[in-house]
Interface confidence: low
């Protein structure tokens, strides 16, 4: 007869490992007992269990509660055992020694691989601001055995760099994602993808990018200067900009205080029925934590009694 086993048994941390050992004997041969031992290099053999055909399973104290026979039905020639809740320290070489009658003793060895799935973590980099050069957006670290694979899934253009640190029984892999911040990246997902043979599917951690910026300011409302005449109602100026964080707006008049009756409502400046007193230079000041911008316009309220219209100047400054 001969022993059938596996050269390598691979199991994920925490799962049960079946250590196979089957004696394929000739007709009439019987298995008396199967002895399982751990036989790592440089150490003496450590008994796991003894599987006796008559007396049943005896588990050594060091493995009490962790070694069992596979569930029924059982073949009397099958000396396989289950090692419950595999831990990384279980990784190594195991031997089953089968005593048969009348053929004598047989032995076979296998190695147990315990895969340690990674628990990845994603750490965002420093605050991203438009105008910066190549900047760390995020780093992703995963440790496992064997070493996990760490990649990035994103529409954002950037560069990656990886490094790994080997420990005694595992390896930690860190991948960094660098980019040149631009406002178009705002709200874009940056996903760290960790692959490992101990995972049923890739693990993904998503970070949403936030890039601070402030667009140039401009003022709308003076497109048709002929509408700005004495007596007109509902005239307004609207300050246009965008930014991250969202900006705040402030209106001032360069050549004096805001006329009475003029309403400031965030980005909008609302006028009462127009008079010549409303003529002047108005400034919209836009700011957020990142930057500030100004845009100024000159309002000339036309008198319909006069023959010719006056020019309107728009000036934008930052």
């Amino acid at each position: 007869g001969e022993l059938e086993t596996s050269d390598v048994v691979t199991v994920v941390l925490g799962q049960d490992a079946k250590l196979p050992c089957f004696y394929r004997g000739d007709s009439g041969e019987q298995v008396g007992q199967v002895a399982w031992a751990r036989v790592d290099a440089g150490e003496g053999a450590q008994e796991l269990a003894l599987l006796h055909s008559k007396y049943g399973l005896h588990v050594s104290p060091a493995y009490e509660g962790r070694v069992e026979q596979p569930p029924p039905p059982r073949n009397p020639l099958d000396g396989s055992v289950l090692l419950r809740n595999a831990v990384q320290a279980d990784e190594g070489e195991y031997e089953c020694r089968v005593s048969t009658f009348p053929a004598g003793s047989f032995q076979a060895r296998l190695r147990l691989r315990v895969l340690v799935p990674p628990l990845p973590s994603l750490n965002p980099g420093p605050a991203l601001e438009e105008g910066q050069g190549l900047t760390l957006a995020a780093s992703c670290t995963a440790e496992g055995s064997p070493a996990p694979s760490v990649t990035w899934d994103t529409e954002v253009k950037g560069t990656t760099s990886s490094r790994s640190f080997k420990h005694s029984r595992s390896a930690a892999v860190t991948s960094e994602f660098h980019l040149v911040p631009s406002r178009s990246m705002n709200g874009q997902p940056l996903t760290c993808v960790v692959s490992h043979p101990g995972l049923l599917q890739d693990q993904r951690i998503t970070h949403i990018l936030h890039v601070s910026f402030l667009a140039e300011a401009s003022v709308r409302g003076l497109e048709d200067q002929n509408l700005w005449h004495i007596g007109r109602e509902g005239a307004m100026l609207k300050c246009l900009s965008e930014g991250q964080p969202p900006p705040s707006y402030n209106w001032t008049r360069l050549d004096g205080p805001l006329p009475s009756g003029v309403r400031v409502d965030g980005d909008t400046l609302g006028f009462p029925p127009l008079t010549t007193e409303h003529s002047g230079i108005y400034v919209c000041h836009v700011s957020n934590e990142f930057s500030s911008r100004d845009s100024q316009v000159t309002v000339d309220v036309l008198d319909p009694q006069e023959d010719s219209g006056k020019q309107v100047d728009l000036v934008s400054a930052s």
């Epitope: 390598v8 290099a41 390896a171």
Partner: antibody, heavy 122, light 107 residues
């Protein structure tokens, strides 16, 4: 830097026994953490795993060759050897020895000898 | 035993272009798959292990992917020294087996 070097006769007669030795330099076979394997490649064909051995002497063989193969290790000489009995012309191949790390990655044959051509012919 | 089938048997590509080599296993090998490069008169050289991890000293133009039964080796920009025979190898189940190889030749 670990290096492997195969040695042995390049010509074996049919029905004879092929014997090769692999000498490991730059590292100790008995330091553990590695299996040591024999792999062969017939002319113009693919690779075939013959078997592997641990320094403790435990061996694993390809079932297709198991009845004819013996691999053993001599830690005092830092060598491991292959014996293949009852050879035929089909055993003509380049024979490589290789290192197989365990349990650390890469868990695949990462270092190979340069190979030795063995011809089975009368 | 697990049979590995590589395709195509021969692949003709121009230098600088991308090459994609396939390996299919007759049953799942999880991620226990490696890729080797072999040049005439030389021993195989380990490129990829664990299906997707590059071996030490292997340029990043080589990448591996897949798990279970379907695997791919990609060479992003072919250099003149990349033209060789490539083998996949499974070590998830005994006996350990190799694919029949893909010859990558200059177009």
């Amino acid at each position: 830097q670990v290096q492997l070097q195969e040695s042995g006769p390049g010509l074996v007669k049919p029905s004879g026994t092929l014997s090769l030795t692999c000498t490991v330099s730059g590292g100790s076979i008995s330091s553990g953490g590695y299996y040591w394997a024999w792999i062969r490649q017939p002319p113009g064909k693919g690779l075939e795993w013959i078997g592997s051995i641990y320094y403790t002497g435990s061996t694993y063989y390809n079932p297709s060759l198991k009845s004819r193969v013996t691999i053993y290790v001599d830690t005092s000489k830092n060598q491991f050897s292959l014996k293949l009995s009852s050879v035929t012309a089909a055993d003509t191949a380049v024979y490589y020895c290789a290192r197989d790390p365990f349990p650390e990655p890469p868990d695949a044959f990462d270092i190979w000898g340069q190979g030795t051509m063995v011809t089975v012919s009368s | 035993e697990i049979v590995l089938t590589q395709s195509p048997a021969t692949l003709s590509v121009s230098p600088g272009e991308r090459a994609t080599l396939s390996c299919r296993a007759s049953q799942s090998v999880s991620s226990n798959l490696a890729w080797y490069q072999q040049k005439p008169g030389q021993a195989p050289r380990l490129l990829i292990y664990g299906a997707s991890s590059r071996a030490t000293g292997i340029p990043d133009r080589f990448s591996g992917s897949g798990s279970g039964t379907d695997f791919t080796l990609t060479i992003s920009r072919l250099e003149p020294e990349d033209f060789a025979v490539y083998y996949c190898h499974q070590y998830g189940s005994s006996p350990l087996t190799f694919g029949g190889g893909t010859k990558l030749e200059i177009k």
